[in-house]
Amino acid sequence: HTAAQDNCTCPTNKMTVCSPDGPGGRCQCRALGSGMAVDCSTLTSKCLLLKARMSAPKNARTLVRPSEHALVDNDGLYDPDCDPEGRFKARQCNQTSVCWCVNSVGVRRTDKGDLSLRCDELVRTHHILIDLRHRPTAGAFNHSDLDAELRRLFRERYRLHPKFVAAVHYEQPTIQIELRQNTSQKAAGDVDIGDAAYYFERDIKGESLFQGRGGLDLRVRGEPLQVERTLIYYLDEIPPKFSMKRLTA
């Protein structure tokens, strides 16, 4: 768990407290809120980031149609329970003993219940669809250049292996980025698509999680790409379980 040795900060997570108290005086960083040690050479898990955020002071070219089982994070922020590896616990509860099951990106996938609710396993989100609308430009971006730029971004900024960016679709002004990562595909050390998507979402909102790095300046052959709307859909390996009442609402 090392960070930049010269000034002991965490380049990949500004929501940390760092000090040279690791083995041999090495810089060690702990996430705010949870106090868990984080690996500053890679992205911090979304669960630990959400927890830190809640602890901080308040201030074919055709587009993809999300499947009927796609989830959108409508519940917003909450203070999650994370396991010792920093992953979301399958069951989340609030202070009023209302509980629900979440997927690996922390999005609710069942109706809310009480403390008797059982969530047998953490269901993996294996497909994420990031739906963006860019601000008007003089003309459409070149699709291949846009595609390459977004793939480069996920490789370079978020350290997501190129094999996990399944596709980039573009129909001006809508851009869709598809991330896919099955349990069997994800090797030790691989960045999780859920974590990459969360960092990207925060970057797009101008809330970069990186320390001492400029905000996201997306350009396609020098032309600024400014995003005005973002929607993220999450597809789980096992479809969510909501009551018919919610589905017909």
Partner: antibody
Framework: EVQLVQSGPEVKKPGASVKVSCKAS????????IGWVRQAPGQGLEWIGE????????YYTEKFKGRVTMTADTSTSTAYMELSSLRSEDTAVYYC??????????WGQGTLVTVSS | DIQLTQSPSSLSASVGDRVTITCSAS?????MYWYQQKPGKAPKLLIY???TLQSGVPSRFSGSGSGTDFTLTISSLQPEDFATYYC?????????FGQGTKLEIK
């Protein structure tokens, strides 16, 4: 063991085209990116562009756009870089290199292309 | 395009010397990469993410820096270290390299 084996040296006349191959082994070809870099005699390294092998997405630098074509044959795990309208200043060693979460982690041995009348 | 300028362009040193090569970027980059190239051979990745040694690279090599200023240091030169070194960025297209620093035996 990851290996990138490039085709042999080529001598071409000005105005002609050259196609350099890069055969990959030791990894899942379509999971990666192949970048192309050239080095003129006694000079530094110059990036030409890259191809995402899984999707076929390509990015060429402005300097080479219109003259370079990058392709890949997934059945033989081979990437190709074709440069047309050759001129003497294109004389260089052309390298292919694998990209992942690094820009270039493994390199081919290089292919010398000589353009001379 | 982001220009990378290496300093010095060439350097004569002796075995056992401590050597520092700098790389200055025309605008801020996230990370710097360093490659070693020997005559007639392909470049070899030495350091990634500014300061992380690639597997198999001796610990006498180190990298540091941020923003626009980066350095590669060899703490005690060995005979096999005499080569040309290049810095490289990929924070934005097109990827660019420094012009190289040739390290020669004094």
């Amino acid at each position: 063991e990851v290996q990138l084996v490039q085709s042999g040296p080529e001598v071409k006349k000005p105005g002609a085209s050259v196609k350099v191959s890069c055969k990959a082994s030791g990894f899942t070809f379509t999971d990666y990116v192949i970048g192309w870099v050239r080095q003129a005699p006694g000079q530094g390294l110059e990036w030409i562009g890259e191809i995402y092998l899984g999707s076929g997405t390509i990015y060429y630098t402005e300097k080479f756009k219109g003259r370079v074509t990058m392709t890949a044959d997934t059945s033989t795990s081979t990437a190709y870089m074709e440069l047309s309208s050759l001129r003497s200043e294109d004389t260089a060693v052309y390298y292919c290199a694998r990209g992942s979460i690094f820009p270039f982690d493994y390199w081919g041995q290089g292919t010398l292309v000589t353009v001379s009348s | 395009d982001i220009q990378l300028t290496q300093s010095p362009s060439s350097l004569s040193a002796s075995v056992g010397d401590r050597v520092t090569i700098t790389c200055s970027a025309s605008s801020s980059v996230s990370y710097m990469y360093w490659y070693q190239q020997k005559p007639g051979k392909a470049p070899k990745l030495l350091i990634y993410d500014t300061s992380t040694l690639q597997s198999g690279v001796p610990s006498r090599f180190s990298g540091s820096g941020s923003g626009t200023d980066f350095t590669l240091t060899i703490s005690s030169l060995q005979p096999e270290d005499f080569a040309t070194y290049y810095c490289q960025q990929w924070s934005s297209y097109p990827y660019t390299f420094g012009q190289g620093t040739k390290l020669e035996i004094k």
